[in-house]
């Protein structure tokens, strides 16, 4: 283990492991967020029966949650690193409004919801440094996001619970697809 300052002759510690590469750190960041989603899903599933509900399609129609498609170049067949990276960043930026919605949806996991939101912002920073074609990344319109947020918050209790469940499930799926794709880059 490294020796803190003042406790060795040179007053500086020797690192005890290889520095993290961009790919390793992004991988760890996604897994960190996925752990956070698991913690939030636990509360959601304990609080309501949404996780077993078959009425998901009803609520899903109102949501435009980012999804990976064949054309995004993130799947093994037709894999395209640049197109895929743009899709991942764009998707994460689109998820941000939904993560904002989640902020007031948890009683005992308020801190975890904030951690998921902030760690996603960090992931976007890491990925933007990796991306060469930043011009291709479209940032969501703040006005559109604000009205979407208002609309989601105005839903009845059942729909809000369902929306929370769907956001967490979709975000988890999106991150898992991203993780697989990024490991090929």
């Amino acid at each position: 283990a490294p020796v803190p300052p003042g406790e060795d002759s040179k007053d500086v510690a020797a690192p005890h492991r290889q520095p993290l590469t961009s790919s390793e750190r992004i991988d760890k960041q996604i897994r960190y967020i996925l752990d956070g989603i698991s913690a939030l899903r636990k509360e959601t599933c304990n609080k309501s029966n949404m996780c077993e509900s078959s009425k998901e399609a009803l609520a899903e129609n109102n949501l435009n949650l980012p999804k990976m498609a064949e054309k995004d170049g993130c799947f093994q067949s037709g894999f395209n690193e640049e197109t895929c990276l743009v899709k991942i960043i764009t998707g994460l930026l689109e998820f941000e409004v939904y993560l904002e919605y989640l902020q007031n949806r948890f009683e005992s996991s308020e801190e975890q919801a904030r951690a998921v939101q902030m760690s996603t912002k960090v992931l976007i920073q890491f990925l933007q440094k990796k991306a060469k074609n930043l011009d291709a990344i479209t940032t969501p319109d703040p006005t559109t996001n604000a009205s979407l947020l208002t609309k989601l918050q105005a839903q009845n209790q059942w729909l809000q619970d369902m929306t929370t469940h769907l956001i967490l499930r979709s975000f988890k799926e999106f991150l898992q697809s991203s993780l697989r794709a990024l490991r090929q880059m």
Epitope: P2, A13, P15, P19, S22, R25, Y32, A115, F126
Partner: nanobody, 131 residues
């Protein structure tokens, strides 16, 4: 060579301000949690502030709360400690350190200045608060 370098120390009058900056060479500081520590003459080293790399949580020791602010700059890959309303008791050698203790979801931010391990330390910079 993998190392941390710090800038911004010096002599300042009580009530004044200083900004310390920590940068890395040989690795990317953005990917690491960063802690600030200080050692006053004849005293033990104390952890005063830190910022995580995973979700940007911050922590401040009671002795600096409300006066010091830690922040990250992704454009420059640096971590800064803005020190305002400085007091003579803030005098000492200031160190920045980088570690990976924040990569497990549910980590305890308040342990960042105590029990967590850091991988890299810098050589330290002198801060003197005196009239």
């Amino acid at each position: 060579q993998l190392q941390l370098a710090e800038t911004g120390g010096g002599l300042v009058q009580p009530g004044g301000s200083l900004r310390l900056s920590c940068a890395a060479s040989g690795f990317t500081l953005d990917y690491y949690a960063v802690g600030w520590f200080r050692q006053a003459p004849g005293k033990e080293r104390e952890g005063i502030s830190c910022i995580s790399s995973s979700d940007l949580k911050t922590y401040y020791a009671d002795s600096v709360k409300g006066r010091f602010t830690i922040s990250r700059d992704y454009a420059k890959s640096t971590v800064s400690l803005q020190m305002n309303s400085l007091k003579p008791e803030d005098t000492g050698v200031y160190y920045c350190a980088a570690g990976t203790w924040d990569l497990k979801f549910g980590y305890n931010i308040s342990a960042c200045v105590g029990s967590y391990e850091y991988d890299y330390w810098d050589q330290g910079t002198q801060v003197t608060v005196s009239s």
